[in-house]
């Protein structure tokens, strides 16, 4: 048999060989498509099929408007002038162009050492579903599953059979001061149809920059505690990879394990001091908050104390 | 018998949209065909613009594909057309035909781009 | 894009003698099976009417005068012999890849 592509709404004709090319002629044609239970025949003559197939005068099978459904097998068995019978066989599919692919929410610069997300691939109203890829300077990316992977998505339309494609790509730069492009194609995989490409973006990759700020926030606000209660010493960091943090009171440094959070439950007059967080991160090495003052004292007694937490929460310098 | 019948405003201001309708008589428009729209501008050039097929799925001209869109209502046997960001180049008649063939016509509608 | 180009741009024609309209398409407009051109007439104040589709097959109740011909790039119109009503001018049109027109062949009767 023949293999034939129709792209969908537009019209295909499947010719009957051997049929004479002017009625007289003896033929039939069969089809086993998504519209049909089994095999269905046609003829000549016509009739309420004439919408979605209809048989022309010289023995050819005009489909109007191709569709998903009219995917599938089409057969014709025709006598010639000389009493031979003839047959052809046809195996059809259908396929849609989808619109350009789009990089959506692309990352405007990538960090070396940690995962990026590096945008999200999207192609709309394919069929059959085709595959997105991505490229790197122009050469296909394989995803490995450690520096460079792939999520992908694909859902289909319910009324059309259309199918929407998504692709999410996530790299792992291994070194700064670089500019990589990335581009996604989308591939019918249909012979003689070029890949759709998207628009490239050209993303600079920056070395793991010092931490732009190191903050120490305290609960109750302030840093004033009444015996028995609990406080609460957040060092939020803004660094990726998170950074070690580790503590200090009053100029030494206390031996916890490293952790973002120190908690002081019940406290007592031996927990006052000067507590400051060191962020450790591998390639800039400590980065020191500045410091907040805990006083231990009975409610309403005293206000803040020069050097401590003010009203945001945020540990300011005397 | 099928028949098909465009109406929208014969008058529409540069940078605004123009909305046309077809609305199909004595056929489905999800039994089959697909389902056109084609201007004929004043020096008599036809240009087909897009279609949407009896499934639902649509394809344009790629001159016209940021600007036009082609959607249907299948409980009035209707489909329409919008083209956005007009200029007085969108000066023209407007058709709507059946596909595959173009065997049915609408009669067209003059649509004019003015300030 | 596949383009079509018609010729003449126009033609006069005597009562009964033989009209021929050319269409060239920039691509093969055919497939081994069929070749995916249509002709239509357009008279003023009407939207064109279909003649001929699929290159050869008259559409139905179209008079026998026309018949059309071609394969592959080359398509030919002809109406012979031409009457008073077929003053008009006609179209060539692909569906082979999307749809494109012709730029028109305006036929008057002499």
């Known amino acids: 048999g023949q293999n034939i592509t129709a792209r969908i709404g537009e019209p295909l004709v499947l010719s009957c060989k051997g049929a004479p090319k002017k009625p007289p002629q003896q033929l039939e044609w069969k089809l086993n498509t998504g519209r049909t239970e089994a095999w269905k025949v046609l003829s000549p003559q016509g009739g309420p099929w004439d919408s979605v197939a209809r048989i022309l005068p010289n023995g050819s099978l005009l489909l109007p408007a191709t569709g998903i459904v009219d995917e599938g097998t089409f057969r014709c068995r025709a006598t010639n002038r000389r009493g031979k019978e003839v047959k052809s066989n046809y195996r059809v599919r259908v396929y849609q162009i989808p619109g350009k692919p789009e990089i959506v929410d692309p990352a405007s610069e990538l960090t070396a050492s940690v995962p990026n997300k590096v945008g999200t691939c999207v192609s709309e109203g394919s069929y059959p579903a085709g595959t997105l890829s991505w490229h790197l300077d122009g050469k296909l990316l394989i995803p490995d599953g450690k520096e460079t992977l792939v999520k992908e998505e694909t859902r289909r339309h319910p009324e059309t059979g259309l199918f929407t494609l998504r692709s999410e790509l996530t790299v792992i730069p291994t070194q700064g001061g670089t500019h990589p492009t990335f581009s996604c194609s989308f591939s019918l995989g249909l012979p003689r149809r070029r890949p759709l490409n998207t628009a490239p973006i050209q993303l600079r990759v920056r070395e793991p920059g010092p931490p732009e700020g190191i903050q120490l926030l305290v609960e109750p606000e302030g840093g004033i505690v009444a015996p028995g209660g609990t406080v609460t010493l957040t060092c939020a960091i803004s660094a990726q990879p998170p950074p070690q943090v580790h503590w200090i009171k009053d100029g030494a440094p206390l031996p916890l394990a490293p952790s973002p959070v120190l908690l002081l439950p019940e406290v007592g007059h031996e927990d006052e001091g000067t507590y400051s967080c060191v962020a450790t991160h591998p390639s800039h090495g400590p980065q020191e908050s500045p410091p907040v003052s805990i006083r231990v004292t009975e409610t309403g007694d005293e206000g803040p104390a020069e050097g401590s937490v003010g009203e945001s929460g945020l540990g300011t310098l005397a | 018998d099928v028949q098909l019948q465009e109406s929208g405003p014969d008058l529409v201001k540069p940078s605004q949209s123009l909305s046309l309708t077809c609305t199909v008589t004595?056929?489905?428009?999800?039994?089959?065909?697909?389902w056109h729209w084609i201007r004929q501008f004043p020096g008599n050039k036809l240009e087909w613009m897009g279609y949407?097929?009896?499934?639902?799925?649509?394809n344009y001209n790629p001159s016209l594909k940021s600007r036009i869109s082609i959607t249907r209502d299948t409980s009035k046997n209707q489909f329409f057309l919008q083209l956005n960001s007009v200029t007085t180049e969108d000066t023209a008649t407007y058709y709507c035909?059946?596909?595959?063939?173009?065997?049915?016509w609408g009669q067209g509608t003059l649509v004019t781009v003015s300030a | 894009d596949i383009v079509l180009t018609q010729s003449p741009a126009s033609l006069a024609v005597s009562l009964g003698q033989r009209a021929t309209i050319s269409c060239r398409a920039s691509?093969?407009?055919?497939?081994?099976?069929?070749?995916?051109m249509h002709w239509y007439q357009q008279k003023p104040g009407q939207p064109p009417k279909l003649l001929i589709y699929l290159a050869s097959n008259l559409e139905s109740g179209v008079p026998a005068r026309f018949s059309g011909s071609g394969s592959g790039t080359d398509f030919t119109l002809n109406i012979h012999p031409v009457e008073e009503e077929d003053a008009a001018t006609y179209y060539c049109?692909?569906?082979?890849?999307?749809?494109?027109f012709g730029g028109g062949t305006k036929l008057e009767i002499k």
């Open positions: 949407i097929h009896y499934s639902g799925s649509t």
């Open positions: 035909a059946r596909g595959g063939d173009f065997a049915y």
């Open positions: 691509k093969s407009v055919g497939t081994s099976d069929s070749s995916y």
């Open positions: 004595g056929y489905s428009i999800t039994s089959g065909y697909s």
């Open positions: 049109q692909h569906s082979r890849e999307l749809y494109t």
